[in-house]
Interface confidence: low
Amino acid sequence: SGRGEAETRECIYYNANWELERTNQSGLERCEGEQDKRLHCYASWRNSSGTIELVKKGCWLDDFNCYDRQECVATEENPQVYFCCCEGNFCNERFTHLPEAGGPEVTYEPPPTAPTLLT
């Protein structure tokens, strides 16, 4: 109990800083949460003059801002790093920027990859 209907167990994983942090670069991440806490996926990225630079993707624990979001949508107007979170397995595969103040919706889809499972 305490989890959303779209229960999150696995998320797309990515770490742009994988060499320095000694992790895998990409794959799948199994989410582990505390009892009665909700689990989410997230994505963070930068947008340099229209060029999308993916920063990280993975599991995100019990954040109110992620509740009942089936899609990963960043709503900040013009942050240094875009951040979105969502509920549901692999919901962070695609991510979108849709400013709350209005403006064009921009959806980013990843290139097809053969992900490896992180343990």
């Epitope: 997230y42 963070s44 995100w60 019990d62 109110f64 801002n65 509740y67 942050p79 790093v81």
Partner: antibody, heavy 114, light 106 residues
Framework: VQLVQSGAEVKKPGESLKISCKTS????????IGWVRQMPGKGLEWMGR????????DYSPSFQGHVIMSVDKSVSTAYLHWNSLKASDTAMYYC????????WGQGTTVTVSS | IQMTQSPSAMSASVGDRVTITCRAS??????LAWFQQKPGKVPKRLIY???SLQSGVPSRFSGSGSGTEFTLTITSLQPEDFATYYC?????????FGQGTKLEIK
């Protein structure tokens, strides 16, 4: 789950200061860390929050440019840093876990006086 | 977003039912938490998501509301409930606390 903050500090105006918030009992990068100020005899003020995953921070306009939030993932610790303290920075500072501040540190008292 | 708590102070007796109100200057859905702080102590979250009771918090505490108006209710006040209560909205930046409600013994 625990957030343990560094000890009380007494500083002079113009000096720099960095206080810490060491977390344990959970995955540090899975929760935002928020900072809250409480001036003597006053209410709670939300200063900002930092995403430990990529160190992205949101600041309240009241604190933007005067304090810097940072993290060190290798030791699961968040920091609040002042380059130049003012007497008006005298307050209790709390770190807390998550967007809705579910778990709090014990607080760090900062006294700035000449 | 401005959060206005009322009353700013009140006195009540053990066993009383007490209601504290928090109004948001614009809609915040249910992105609201309630905190209790005793003198010299760390704030403690009582309610999150406007109406969800924090684990370990006595059931005499309850929260309700959505949008712009929220209430914290304490049924049958206990001696340990005399403290200052704050609401927090975490829907829009900058997140903001109410100014606090000091609950004193009558």
């Amino acid at each position: 789950v625990q957030l343990v903050q560094s000890g009380a500090e007494v500083k002079k105006p113009g000096e720099s200061l960095k206080i810490s918030c060491k977390t344990s009992g959970y995955t540090f990068t899975h929760y935002w860390i928020g900072w809250v100020r409480q001036m003597p005899g006053k209410g709670l003020e939300w200063m900002g929050r930092i995403n430990p995953t990529d160190s992205y921070a949101d600041y309240s306009p009241s604190f933007q440019g005067h304090v810097i939030m940072s993290v060190d993932k290798s030791v699961s610790t968040a920091y609040l840093h002042w380059n130049s303290l003012k007497a008006s920075d005298t307050a209790m500072y709390y770190c807390a876990r998550g967007t809705a501040l579910g778990v709090w540190g014990q607080g760090t008292t900062v006294t700035v006086s000449s | 977003i401005q959060m206005t708590q009322s009353p700013s102070a009140m006195s009540a007796s053990v066993g009383d039912r007490v209601t504290i109100t928090c109004r948001a200057s614009q809609g915040i859905s249910n992105y609201l938490a309630w905190f209790q702080q005793k003198p010299g102590k760390v704030p403690k979250r009582l309610i999150y998501a406007a109406s969800s009771l924090q684990s370990g918090v006595p059931s005499r505490f309850s929260g309700s509301g959505s949008g712009t108006e929220f209430t914290l209710t304490i049924t049958s006040l206990q001696p340990e409930d005399f403290a200052t209560y704050y609401c927090l909205q975490h829907k829009s930046y900058p997140y903001t606390f109410g100014q606090g409600t000091k609950l004193e013994i009558k």
